[in-house]
Protein backbone atom coordinates (compact mmCIF):
# COMPACT_ATOMS: atom_id res chain seq x y z
CA UNK A 1 0.00 0.00 0.00
CA UNK A 2 1.12 3.55 -0.70
CA UNK A 3 0.52 4.66 2.92
CA UNK A 4 2.79 2.02 4.43
CA UNK A 5 5.92 3.27 6.13
CA UNK A 6 9.04 2.64 4.06
CA UNK A 7 11.21 -0.26 5.14
CA UNK A 8 14.60 0.36 6.75
CA UNK A 9 16.30 -0.78 3.56
CA UNK A 10 13.75 0.32 0.95
CA UNK A 11 13.79 -1.20 -2.50
CA UNK A 12 15.21 1.06 -5.20
CA UNK A 13 13.77 1.03 -8.68
CA UNK A 14 15.26 1.94 -12.04
CA UNK A 15 13.25 4.74 -13.66
CA UNK A 16 13.22 6.42 -17.04
CA UNK A 17 14.59 9.96 -16.77
CA UNK A 18 13.60 12.66 -19.27
CA UNK A 19 13.80 16.42 -18.93
CA UNK A 20 16.14 19.14 -17.76
CA UNK A 21 16.87 17.63 -14.36
CA UNK A 22 18.28 14.47 -15.95
CA UNK A 23 21.28 16.10 -17.61
CA UNK A 24 22.77 13.56 -20.01
CA UNK A 25 21.31 10.59 -18.13
CA UNK A 26 18.35 8.64 -19.46
CA UNK A 27 17.63 6.82 -16.20
CA UNK A 28 17.80 7.24 -12.45
CA UNK A 29 17.32 5.12 -9.36
CA UNK A 30 14.88 5.85 -6.56
CA UNK A 31 12.10 4.64 -4.33
CA UNK A 32 9.42 5.86 -6.73
CA UNK A 33 9.27 6.70 -10.41
CA UNK A 34 7.18 9.54 -11.81
CA UNK A 35 5.90 11.02 -15.04
CA UNK A 36 4.72 14.61 -15.02
CA UNK A 37 3.26 17.31 -17.22
CA UNK A 38 3.19 20.94 -16.19
CA UNK A 39 2.25 24.18 -17.88
CA UNK A 40 5.15 26.59 -17.56
CA UNK A 41 4.41 30.06 -18.95
CA UNK A 42 2.35 28.52 -21.72
CA UNK A 43 4.68 25.64 -22.54
CA UNK A 44 3.83 22.01 -21.92
CA UNK A 45 6.80 20.58 -20.03
CA UNK A 46 7.13 16.82 -19.77
CA UNK A 47 9.42 15.20 -17.23
CA UNK A 48 10.14 11.68 -16.06
CA UNK A 49 12.36 10.67 -13.21
CA UNK A 50 12.56 9.33 -9.70
CA UNK A 51 12.18 10.31 -6.10
CA UNK A 52 15.24 9.12 -4.22
CA UNK A 53 13.55 9.48 -0.85
CA UNK A 54 10.11 8.07 -0.11
CA UNK A 55 8.92 11.17 1.73
CA UNK A 56 9.99 13.35 -1.19
CA UNK A 57 7.49 11.74 -3.50
CA UNK A 58 4.77 11.03 -0.96
CA UNK A 59 3.04 14.43 -1.12
CA UNK A 60 3.73 15.06 -4.79
CA UNK A 61 2.29 11.72 -5.82
CA UNK A 62 -0.86 12.29 -3.79
CA UNK A 63 -1.57 15.67 -5.41
CA UNK A 64 -4.59 15.41 -7.72
CA UNK A 65 -4.19 16.73 -11.26
CA UNK A 66 -4.90 20.43 -11.67
CA UNK A 67 -5.30 22.55 -14.80
CA UNK A 68 -1.59 23.32 -14.61
CA UNK A 69 0.10 20.17 -13.38
CA UNK A 70 -0.33 16.42 -13.32
CA UNK A 71 1.98 13.83 -11.80
CA UNK A 72 1.69 10.05 -11.98
CA UNK A 73 3.85 7.87 -9.77
CA UNK A 74 4.62 4.18 -9.70
CA UNK A 75 6.89 1.64 -8.06
CA UNK A 76 8.69 -0.95 -10.16
CA UNK A 77 11.65 -1.08 -12.49
CA UNK A 78 11.05 1.15 -15.53
CA UNK A 79 7.38 1.48 -14.53
CA UNK A 80 7.19 5.06 -15.82
CA UNK A 81 8.36 4.14 -19.31
CA UNK A 82 4.87 3.96 -20.78
CA UNK A 83 3.16 6.46 -18.49
CA UNK A 84 2.34 9.89 -19.88
CA UNK A 85 0.80 12.29 -17.39
CA UNK A 86 -2.29 14.08 -18.66
CA UNK A 87 -4.00 17.22 -17.47
CA UNK A 88 -7.70 16.89 -16.59
CA UNK A 89 -9.82 17.30 -19.72
CA UNK A 90 -12.05 20.14 -18.59
CA UNK A 91 -12.37 22.97 -21.06
CA UNK A 92 -9.99 24.08 -23.74
CA UNK A 93 -7.79 26.85 -22.48
CA UNK A 94 -5.82 27.54 -19.35
CA UNK A 95 -5.86 31.28 -18.63
CA UNK A 96 -4.49 32.00 -15.20
CA UNK A 97 -2.54 28.74 -14.94
CA UNK A 98 0.67 29.91 -16.50
CA UNK A 99 3.36 28.84 -14.06
CA UNK A 100 3.51 25.40 -12.54
CA UNK A 101 6.68 23.54 -11.75
CA UNK A 102 7.45 20.10 -10.45
CA UNK A 103 10.06 20.74 -7.80
Amino acid sequence: MEDEKPKVNPKLYMCVCEGLSCGNEDHCEGQQCFSSLSINDGFHVYQKGCFQVYEQGKMTCKTPPSPGQAVECCQGDWCNRNITAQLPTKGKSFPGTQNFHLE
Epitope: I83, T84, K92, P95
Partner: antibody
Protein backbone atom coordinates in the same frame (compact mmCIF):
# COMPACT_ATOMS: atom_id res chain seq x y z
CA UNK B 1 -13.34 32.03 -32.89
CA UNK B 2 -9.65 31.36 -32.30
CA UNK B 3 -7.67 32.81 -35.18
CA UNK B 4 -4.08 33.48 -36.22
CA UNK B 5 -3.31 35.75 -39.18
CA UNK B 6 0.24 36.17 -40.46
CA UNK B 7 1.53 39.11 -42.48
CA UNK B 8 4.79 40.75 -43.52
CA UNK B 9 6.08 38.26 -46.05
CA UNK B 10 7.52 39.27 -49.38
CA UNK B 11 10.57 39.31 -51.63
CA UNK B 12 13.88 40.27 -50.06
CA UNK B 13 17.49 40.12 -51.23
CA UNK B 14 20.05 37.83 -49.58
CA UNK B 15 21.45 39.53 -46.50
CA UNK B 16 18.31 41.58 -46.09
CA UNK B 17 15.78 41.77 -43.28
CA UNK B 18 12.06 41.24 -42.86
CA UNK B 19 9.65 41.29 -39.94
CA UNK B 20 6.70 38.92 -39.85
CA UNK B 21 3.64 39.47 -37.69
CA UNK B 22 0.97 37.13 -36.43
CA UNK B 23 -2.21 38.74 -35.15
CA UNK B 24 -4.13 36.57 -32.69
CA UNK B 25 -7.75 36.76 -31.64
CA UNK B 26 -10.35 34.73 -29.78
CA UNK B 27 -8.25 33.62 -26.81
CA UNK B 28 -6.23 34.90 -23.86
CA UNK B 29 -3.07 35.60 -25.82
CA UNK B 30 -0.66 36.02 -22.90
CA UNK B 31 -1.43 32.54 -21.53
CA UNK B 32 -0.10 30.73 -24.57
CA UNK B 33 3.33 29.87 -25.82
CA UNK B 34 3.56 30.43 -29.56
CA UNK B 35 5.73 29.09 -32.34
CA UNK B 36 6.81 29.84 -35.87
CA UNK B 37 6.98 26.88 -38.26
CA UNK B 38 8.15 27.16 -41.85
CA UNK B 39 7.87 25.14 -45.03
CA UNK B 40 10.21 25.57 -47.97
CA UNK B 41 8.63 25.04 -51.41
CA UNK B 42 8.01 21.34 -51.96
CA UNK B 43 9.59 20.46 -48.59
CA UNK B 44 8.44 19.43 -45.15
CA UNK B 45 7.62 21.34 -41.98
CA UNK B 46 10.42 22.84 -39.88
CA UNK B 47 9.94 24.37 -36.45
CA UNK B 48 11.74 27.74 -36.33
CA UNK B 49 11.19 29.41 -32.99
CA UNK B 50 9.00 29.57 -29.90
CA UNK B 51 8.25 32.07 -27.17
CA UNK B 52 6.61 31.69 -23.77
CA UNK B 53 3.37 33.38 -22.82
CA UNK B 54 5.05 36.21 -20.93
CA UNK B 55 7.77 36.56 -23.56
CA UNK B 56 10.42 35.77 -20.98
CA UNK B 57 11.68 32.59 -22.64
CA UNK B 58 12.61 32.16 -26.29
CA UNK B 59 13.88 29.18 -28.26
CA UNK B 60 15.32 28.80 -31.76
CA UNK B 61 16.21 26.13 -34.27
CA UNK B 62 19.96 25.94 -34.89
CA UNK B 63 19.41 26.97 -38.51
CA UNK B 64 18.18 30.46 -37.51
CA UNK B 65 19.93 31.06 -34.19
CA UNK B 66 21.65 34.44 -34.12
CA UNK B 67 19.77 35.68 -37.18
CA UNK B 68 16.09 35.51 -36.18
CA UNK B 69 14.43 37.05 -33.13
CA UNK B 70 11.01 36.07 -31.86
CA UNK B 71 9.03 38.51 -29.72
CA UNK B 72 5.48 39.32 -28.74
CA UNK B 73 3.39 42.28 -27.68
CA UNK B 74 0.71 40.96 -25.34
CA UNK B 75 -1.05 44.32 -25.29
CA UNK B 76 -1.56 44.03 -29.05
CA UNK B 77 -2.12 40.26 -29.18
CA UNK B 78 0.64 40.03 -31.75
CA UNK B 79 3.58 37.70 -32.32
CA UNK B 80 6.63 38.79 -34.33
CA UNK B 81 9.58 37.21 -36.10
CA UNK B 82 12.43 39.56 -36.97
CA UNK B 83 14.53 37.93 -39.67
CA UNK B 84 17.99 39.32 -40.40
CA UNK B 85 20.86 38.16 -42.63
CA UNK B 86 18.39 36.29 -44.76
CA UNK B 87 19.60 33.46 -47.00
CA UNK B 88 18.11 31.70 -50.00
CA UNK B 89 17.40 28.68 -47.81
CA UNK B 90 15.10 30.79 -45.65
CA UNK B 91 12.65 30.94 -48.55
CA UNK B 92 9.47 29.36 -47.23
CA UNK B 93 5.91 29.80 -46.11
CA UNK B 94 6.00 30.87 -42.46
CA UNK B 95 3.19 29.79 -40.15
CA UNK B 96 2.47 30.78 -36.58
CA UNK B 97 0.97 28.01 -34.51
CA UNK B 98 -0.19 27.31 -30.96
CA UNK B 99 -1.21 24.35 -28.83
CA UNK B 100 -4.59 25.90 -28.03
CA UNK B 101 -6.40 22.96 -26.45
CA UNK B 102 -4.29 22.50 -23.36
CA UNK B 103 -5.39 18.90 -22.92
CA UNK B 104 -3.83 18.12 -26.32
CA UNK B 105 -0.51 18.19 -24.50
CA UNK B 106 1.47 20.54 -26.72
CA UNK B 107 0.38 19.52 -30.22
CA UNK B 108 -0.22 22.48 -32.55
CA UNK B 109 -3.97 22.52 -33.18
CA UNK B 110 -4.32 26.13 -34.33
CA UNK B 111 -2.37 27.41 -37.34
CA UNK B 112 -2.39 30.61 -39.32
CA UNK B 113 -2.77 30.61 -43.09
CA UNK B 114 0.92 31.35 -43.60
CA UNK B 115 2.91 34.13 -45.23
CA UNK B 116 5.43 33.59 -48.02
CA UNK B 117 9.01 34.81 -47.69
CA UNK B 118 11.19 34.71 -50.79
CA UNK B 119 14.90 35.43 -50.52
CA UNK B 120 16.36 36.03 -53.97
CA UNK B 121 18.54 38.47 -55.83
CA UNK C 1 17.83 16.60 -31.07
CA UNK C 2 15.26 13.90 -31.71
CA UNK C 3 15.08 12.89 -35.36
CA UNK C 4 11.72 11.77 -36.71
CA UNK C 5 11.76 9.44 -39.70
CA UNK C 6 8.64 8.66 -41.72
CA UNK C 7 8.09 5.82 -44.13
CA UNK C 8 7.32 5.37 -46.89
CA UNK C 9 8.00 8.70 -48.57
CA UNK C 10 5.11 8.04 -50.95
CA UNK C 11 2.24 5.62 -50.52
CA UNK C 12 -0.14 4.73 -53.35
CA UNK C 13 -3.46 3.30 -52.20
CA UNK C 14 -6.86 2.85 -53.84
CA UNK C 15 -9.91 4.66 -52.44
CA UNK C 16 -11.77 2.51 -49.93
CA UNK C 17 -8.61 0.64 -48.97
CA UNK C 18 -6.55 0.90 -45.79
CA UNK C 19 -3.43 3.06 -45.56
CA UNK C 20 -0.72 2.56 -42.93
CA UNK C 21 1.91 5.25 -42.36
CA UNK C 22 4.91 4.83 -40.07
CA UNK C 23 6.94 7.23 -37.95
CA UNK C 24 10.05 6.42 -35.97
CA UNK C 25 11.77 8.57 -33.34
CA UNK C 26 15.54 8.41 -32.76
CA UNK C 27 14.84 8.17 -29.02
CA UNK C 28 11.75 7.73 -26.89
CA UNK C 29 9.12 10.45 -27.05
CA UNK C 30 6.71 8.51 -24.81
CA UNK C 31 3.23 9.12 -26.22
CA UNK C 32 3.90 12.76 -27.02
CA UNK C 33 3.47 12.50 -30.75
CA UNK C 34 1.10 14.23 -33.15
CA UNK C 35 0.00 13.51 -36.71
CA UNK C 36 -0.93 16.28 -39.15
CA UNK C 37 -2.56 16.30 -42.55
CA UNK C 38 -1.63 18.92 -45.11
CA UNK C 39 -3.21 19.60 -48.48
CA UNK C 40 -1.63 21.82 -51.18
CA UNK C 41 -1.88 25.51 -50.37
CA UNK C 42 -3.26 24.88 -46.89
CA UNK C 43 -1.88 24.96 -43.38
CA UNK C 44 -1.37 21.65 -41.56
CA UNK C 45 -4.36 20.21 -39.71
CA UNK C 46 -3.97 18.31 -36.46
CA UNK C 47 -5.37 14.78 -36.69
CA UNK C 48 -3.95 12.87 -33.73
CA UNK C 49 -2.32 13.91 -30.46
CA UNK C 50 -0.94 11.80 -27.65
CA UNK C 51 -0.05 9.19 -30.30
CA UNK C 52 -3.56 7.76 -30.38
CA UNK C 53 -6.24 10.34 -29.58
CA UNK C 54 -8.20 12.00 -32.38
CA UNK C 55 -8.45 15.78 -32.30
CA UNK C 56 -11.90 17.34 -32.28
CA UNK C 57 -13.80 16.80 -35.52
CA UNK C 58 -11.46 14.17 -36.95
CA UNK C 59 -13.32 11.19 -38.49
CA UNK C 60 -13.10 7.78 -36.80
CA UNK C 61 -11.39 6.27 -39.84
CA UNK C 62 -8.18 7.94 -38.64
CA UNK C 63 -6.40 6.12 -35.83
CA UNK C 64 -2.98 6.34 -34.28
CA UNK C 65 -0.99 3.83 -32.28
CA UNK C 66 2.43 3.29 -30.76
CA UNK C 67 4.59 4.71 -28.00
CA UNK C 68 8.26 5.24 -27.33
CA UNK C 69 9.93 5.23 -30.72
CA UNK C 70 7.52 3.47 -33.11
CA UNK C 71 4.24 5.02 -34.24
CA UNK C 72 1.60 4.30 -36.85
CA UNK C 73 -1.19 6.30 -38.45
CA UNK C 74 -3.90 4.17 -40.02
CA UNK C 75 -6.69 5.37 -42.29
CA UNK C 76 -9.16 2.51 -42.39
CA UNK C 77 -11.10 3.28 -45.57
CA UNK C 78 -9.60 5.99 -47.74
CA UNK C 79 -11.87 8.77 -48.94
CA UNK C 80 -10.99 11.09 -51.82
CA UNK C 81 -10.34 13.95 -49.37
CA UNK C 82 -7.73 11.91 -47.50
CA UNK C 83 -5.11 12.07 -50.24
CA UNK C 84 -2.59 14.55 -48.89
CA UNK C 85 0.77 14.75 -47.12
CA UNK C 86 0.98 13.49 -43.54
CA UNK C 87 3.54 14.56 -40.94
CA UNK C 88 4.38 13.25 -37.50
CA UNK C 89 5.81 15.55 -34.83
CA UNK C 90 7.20 15.01 -31.35
CA UNK C 91 6.61 17.47 -28.53
CA UNK C 92 8.16 15.48 -25.71
CA UNK C 93 11.73 16.80 -25.78
CA UNK C 94 12.07 20.40 -26.91
CA UNK C 95 13.59 22.55 -28.16
CA UNK C 96 13.44 21.78 -30.93
CA UNK C 97 10.02 20.45 -31.75
CA UNK C 98 10.77 18.08 -34.61
CA UNK C 99 8.71 16.88 -37.56
CA UNK C 100 9.11 13.88 -39.81
CA UNK C 101 9.86 14.56 -43.47
CA UNK C 102 6.32 13.61 -44.48
CA UNK C 103 4.52 10.83 -46.32
CA UNK C 104 2.63 11.67 -49.48
CA UNK C 105 -0.53 9.60 -49.77
CA UNK C 106 -1.58 9.41 -53.40
CA UNK C 107 -4.36 7.72 -55.33
CA UNK C 108 -3.43 4.39 -56.88
Amino acid sequence: EVQLVESGGGLVQPGGSLRLSCAASGFTFSSYAMSWVRQAPGKGLEWVSAISGSGGSTYYADSVKGRFTISRDNSKNTLYLQMNSLRAEDTAVYYCAIPYNWNYGGAFDIWGQGTMVTVSS
Amino acid sequence: EIVMTQSPATLSVSPGKRATLSCRASQSVSSNLAWYQQKPGQAPRLLIYGASTRATGIPARFSGSGSGTEFTLTISSLQSEDFAVYYCQQYNNWPPYTFGQGTKLEIK
